[in-house]
């Protein structure tokens, strides 16, 4: 008897079942149709909260979360200050745009990483123009 499944009729990784009187394809999540030929929209009806965008892949939806949010559906508020990103005693605050560092006197930069020289100049490398000490990270 010919193994009709050897022809690999099931698409997209579907499991072939030879029932004798018929072939049946058991489709992986995210696929449908007699031969699993239809790629379902993983993101259909699935909302990512707080400005996150849904990304299809492997039959399961995934949320790409906006800055400041995390979790499966972007419903959890991420803690941008967890890793203590503000150097030299800077105080870290969660901010709508991510985080902001209040720098201790004598330091500046988005992460308080640059010392301010006594003459008022800073040891900033070529930094983006317009970034002031204590400005929130975009």
């Amino acid at each position: 008897r010919v193994d009709r499944c050897s022809l690999q009729p099931c698409r997209n990784g579907g499991l072939c079942l030879d029932l004798g009187h018929a072939l049946r394809c058991r489709c992986r999540a995210g696929f449908a149709g007699p031969r699993c030929e239809h790629d379902l929209d993983d993101c259909a009806g699935r909302a990512c909260a707080n400005g996150g965008t849904c990304v299809e892949g492997g039959g399961a939806h995934r949320c790409s979360c906006a800055l400041g949010f995390g979790g499966r559906d972007c419903r959890e508020r991420a803690d941008p200050c967890a890793a203590r990103p503000c150097a030299h005693g800077g105080r870290c605050y969660a901010h709508f745009s991510g985080l902001v560092c209040a720098c201790a006197p004598g330091y500046m930069g988005a992460r308080c990483e640059f010392p301010v020289h006594p003459d008022g100049a800073s040891a900033l490398p070529a930094a983006p123009p317009g970034l002031r000490p204590g400005d929130p990270q975009r």
Epitope: R77, P80, C81, A82, Y93, A102
Partner: antibody
Framework: QEQLVESGGGLVQPEGSLTLTCTAS?????????MCWVRQAPGKGLEWIAC????????TDYANWAKGRFSISKTSSTTVTLQMTSLTVADTATYFC???????????????WGPGTLVTVSS | QVLTQTPSPVSAAVGGTVTISCQAS????????LAWYQQKPGQPPKLLIY???SLASGVPSRFKGSGAGTQFTLTISDLECDDAATYYC????????????FGGGTEVVVK
Amino acid sequence: QEQLVESGGGLVQPEGSLTLTCTASGFSFSSSGYMCWVRQAPGKGLEWIACISGGSSGDTDYANWAKGRFSISKTSSTTVTLQMTSLTVADTATYFCARDVYIDSTIFNFNLWGPGTLVTVSS
Amino acid sequence: QVLTQTPSPVSAAVGGTVTISCQASQSVYNNNNLAWYQQKPGQPPKLLIYAASSLASGVPSRFKGSGAGTQFTLTISDLECDDAATYYCQGTYYSSGWYSTFGGGTEVVVK
């Protein structure tokens, strides 16, 4: 509606200990800046005690006079405690919980306060 | 660091103007990290002014903050009976760590 409520106040003997709790509703600490404690002796002014980061870093700041006897900690995403030891009559006060937020490059802006809880130290 | 408020108490008639001074023994953080609070008996303080001169949300424009460095002023114009309260200035500093101090308070009496 964002709210803070303090609890745990009451009468305590000199040299005794007490733990105050601040509970938030309507927001979680991780999405705010720092949570702080401020006290006010009867008929007197305000006195800052300590702050703790609302996030998971647990960074703390203390008034010099409070170091050693007072300890601030975050017990959940909505509760902060203040442990007080070796209490004296001078610690008799209303203890307020307040939220410190960053606004316009300034910090220690207490834009949300609880109603306070009274601690009386007396024998 | 000490914040000295003067005068106390201060009184004025409804519709009048009062000015409260706050003198810091050293410059506050960034020269402008000073806030003003209003407190009524039996209530917690309420943030009025932050960054020395910025009005907090919901606060009427009759309240005006000014100053920088070590000298700050709160002016309340067009006084209303509801303005009767104690007002506190609060400065923020850094010296091997962050800390904050309050002024002693100024009681405003509205006649």
